[in-house]
């Protein structure tokens, strides 16, 4: 058993039929010495008396809020949550496995640049009675600070068979050094509580591996005289790290014909312009990626050939 | 970079960009990683590898003030990785193609080192990897980790040379 926050305790249980459970001793946080009784939210019967209460926790029916009283006066509460371990593996019932880039990916994170600011998100089918909190740091032996905000519900997707909720959180490294080569991983720890179930999820990464630039901006097209070719130009996204002579991007340009199926070969350049052949009704699309490190490509930016 | 002279920024930029490409093309060659447990993955690659850290002055402001600290660190890293890529981690079984990306990467690391330190200038004793002969079964994982680490090192070095070529070239 360990204390998650004041008066909230997590009991780690091996979850199998006829498991012996865990004996937990709850202490009433009071200066009173006698006349103390205990009840739980599950039943209003008096469970015991005295400053401490010993309970056997085997299942969710044994979890919940325990209250110590003196007469009609409430002296304190202790909330007991369960963290299930089945076959040596902690339960992951609350979050949905996103399966990308590999199985058991519950937390996904992205950064728009090297500033030390990143966003993480997760999916759940649960909308109510769920509480999330996120902590983060860099390195584990001598952790360096990262400040994370409050997780918020950012989207709701309804499909035929279920509704999926997307939560996200933004974090900022306290003393980020955008130009340095990272040697210690960023760790993100998510605590999830659904009713009386506690679970935790972690992710470990370098900013360089989660960088995904915003799409190139101000994408423009200029027809070339007496030619079916056009000059396409664009700019670095505003959100990308500066100076661009240091934090350089590479770009790929592709002509997408009207039916969207047929795509011409990608032309990749380090400049912010390119010459391509453009047919009526076609679209030109451009994406960006770090020039020197193969992290994610940005989403496409589009301009019409018309 | 003896004394206070400047490196050939444009040449260094071109070669460091080529190195980045080679390091990424060498990476998939490493074989199926699912066969290997990422044990101790935490911060083990960081062991004795010379990382380009915040205090090394490889950021745009640091380069404007004095390029020497940063270039010194890059030289150390190049020397270190060049030794690693020639060690039995990469020359032993499972064999890699001698003319494949790792072989080219090794030769190009040497090339960039020489651009930064012309013959006859051995001004410091660089950090050398502590190389005990590795067991073949460890090698695929070690190669994978070393190349991942090298990719990160080269990305920073390439940014330094690109910025230098754009802003510090005579």
């Amino acid at each position: 058993i360990w204390e998650l926050e004041k008066d909230v305790y997590v009991v780690e249980l091996d979850w199998y039929p006829d498991a012996p459970g865990e004996t937990v001793v709850l202490t009433c946080d009071t200066s009173e010495e006698d006349g103390i009784t205990w009840t739980s939210e599950q039943s209003n019967k008096v469970l015991g008396s005295g400053k401490t209460l010993t309970i056997l926790v085997k299942e969710f029916g044994d979890a919940g809020q325990y209250t110590c009283h003196k007469g009609d006066k409430v002296l304190g509460h202790s909330k007991v949550l369960l963290h299930k371990k089945e076959d040596g593996i902690w339960s992951t019932d609350i979050l949905k496995d996103q399966k990308e880039p590999k199985s058991k990916t519950f937390l996904k994170c992205e950064a728009k640049n090297y500033s030390g600011h990143f966003t993480c998100w997760w999916l759940t089918a649960i909308s109510r009675d769920v509480k999330f909190s996120v902590k983060s740091n860099r390195g584990s032996s001598d952790p360096q600070g990262v400040t994370c905000g409050v997780p918020t519900l950012s989207a709701e997707r309804v499909s035929v068979d279920h509704t999926e909720y997307k939560f996200s959180v933004e974090c900022q490294e306290d003393n980020a050094c955008p130009a340095a080569e990272e040697s210690l991983h960023l760790e993100v720890m998510l605590d999830a509580i659904h009713k009386l179930k506690y679970e935790n999820y972690t992710s470990s990464f370098f900013i360089r591996d989660i960088v995904k630039p915003d799409p190139p901006q101000n994408l423009q097209m200029k027809p070339l005289k007496n030619s079916r070719h056009v000059e396409v130009s664009w700019e670095y996204p505003d959100t990308w790290s500066t100076p661009h002579s240091y934090f350089s991007l590479t770009f790929c340009v592709q002509v997408q014909n009207k039916n969207k199926k047929e795509k011409k070969d990608r032309l990749c350049v380090d400049k912010t312009s390119a010459t391509v052949m453009c047919h009526k009704d076609a679209k030109i699309r451009v994406q960006a990626r770090d020039r020197y490190y193969s992290s994610s490509w940005s989403e496409w930016a589009f301009v019409s050939c018309n | 970079v003896p004394g206070d002279s400047s490196p050939a920024w444009t040449q260094c930029q071109q070669l460091s960009q080529k190195l980045c490409t080679l390091a990424w093309s060498a990476h998939p060659q490493m074989g199926p990683m699912e066969l290997l447990r990422e044990e101790g993955d935490e911060e083990t690659t960081s062991d004795d590898v010379p990382h380009i850290q915040c205090e090394d002055g490889c950021d745009p402001q640091g380069l404007r003030d004095n390029t020497q600290f940063c270039l010194q660190r890059i030289r150390q890293g190049l020397f270190f990785y060049e030794k690693l890529l020639g060690s039995d981690i990469f020359t032993g079984e499972p064999a890699l193609l001698p003319d494949g990306p790792v072989g080219q990467l090794h030769a190009s690391l040497l090339g960039l080192s020489q651009l930064l330190q012309p013959e006859g200038h051995h001004r410091e004793t660089p950090q050398t990897p502590s190389l005990h002969p590795s067991q073949p079964w460890q090698r695929r994982l070690l190669r994978f980790k070393i190349l991942r680490s090298l990719q990160a090192f080269l990305a920073v070095a390439a940014r330094v040379f690109a910025h230098g070529a754009a802003t510090l070239s005579p």
Partner: antibody, heavy 115, light 107 residues
């Protein structure tokens, strides 16, 4: 073409030393390790040790430690195996071989130890 | 040290026969195993590396299987030039060790 050519047969007295050479050609000598293997008459194969010509790193079979020395000369792309304190049971064919999974072996050098 | 136990130590077979030679490692070696063919007075010739990969130029009648501790070399249809001694070898860790050999003779 890619090949390993070994030095000729040797006849040695017990207690003496023998040095066998293995010249590599057709590939970059420093990109592979070089193993030494021996085979006594009518017997199986026995690994003695290897060298990484790039950095002269060696790895020896405990059985031969102290008696075997493997060296390499990068300038001539040649590996050497020296075995000292020879005894009659060292009579064997000695092979050099590039990485096991590349299939390149020398033709073998017969060393006879006899008084 | 990891021991390699090869069986049988010898076998007699006829041209066209299917021949199977097994090799057992005393510890787990994943697929770090080679098979060699050796003829009298010649150096060993690599047939299979990585337990299952056929060396370039080796006829497809030779195949390797197995992983972990149990490995097999199969010659699907024995040819006159296949009469020789066959060795397995592990390269998982040092010291690298060879099996005792299997001599394939004409019945």
């Amino acid at each position: 073409q890619v090949q390993l050519v070994q030095s000729g047969a040797e006849v040695k007295k017990p207690g003496s030393s023998v040095k066998v050479s293995c010249k590599a050609s057709g590939y970059k000598f420093t990109r592979y390790v070089m193993h030494w293997v021996r085979q006594a008459p009518g017997q199986g194969l026995e690994w003695m040790g290897y060298i990484n010509p790039y950095n002269d790193g060696t790895n020896y079979n405990e059985k031969f430690k102290g008696r075997v020395t493997i060296t390499a000369d990068k300038s001539t792309s040649t590996a050497y195996m020296e075995l000292s304190s020879l005894r009659s049971e060292d009579t064997a064919v000695y092979y050099c071989a590039r990485n096991w999974d590349t299939g390149l072996w020398g033709q073998g050098t017969t060393v006879t130890v006899s008084s | 040290d990891i021991q390699m136990t090869q069986s049988p130590s010898s076998l007699s077979a006829s041209v066209g026969d299917r021949v199977t030679i097994t090799c057992k490692a005393s510890d787990h070696i994943l697929k770090f195993l080679t098979w060699y063919q050796q003829k009298p007075g010649k150096a060993p010739k690599l047939l299979i590396y990585g337990a299952t990969s056929l060396e370039t130029g080796v006829p497809s009648r030779f195949s390797g299987s197995g992983s972990g501790t149990d490995f097999t070399l199969t010659i699907s249809s024995l040819q006159p030039e296949d009469f020789a001694t066959y060795y397995c070898q592990m390269y998982w860790s040092t010291p690298f060790t060879f099996g005792g050999g299997t001599k394939v003779e004409i019945k």
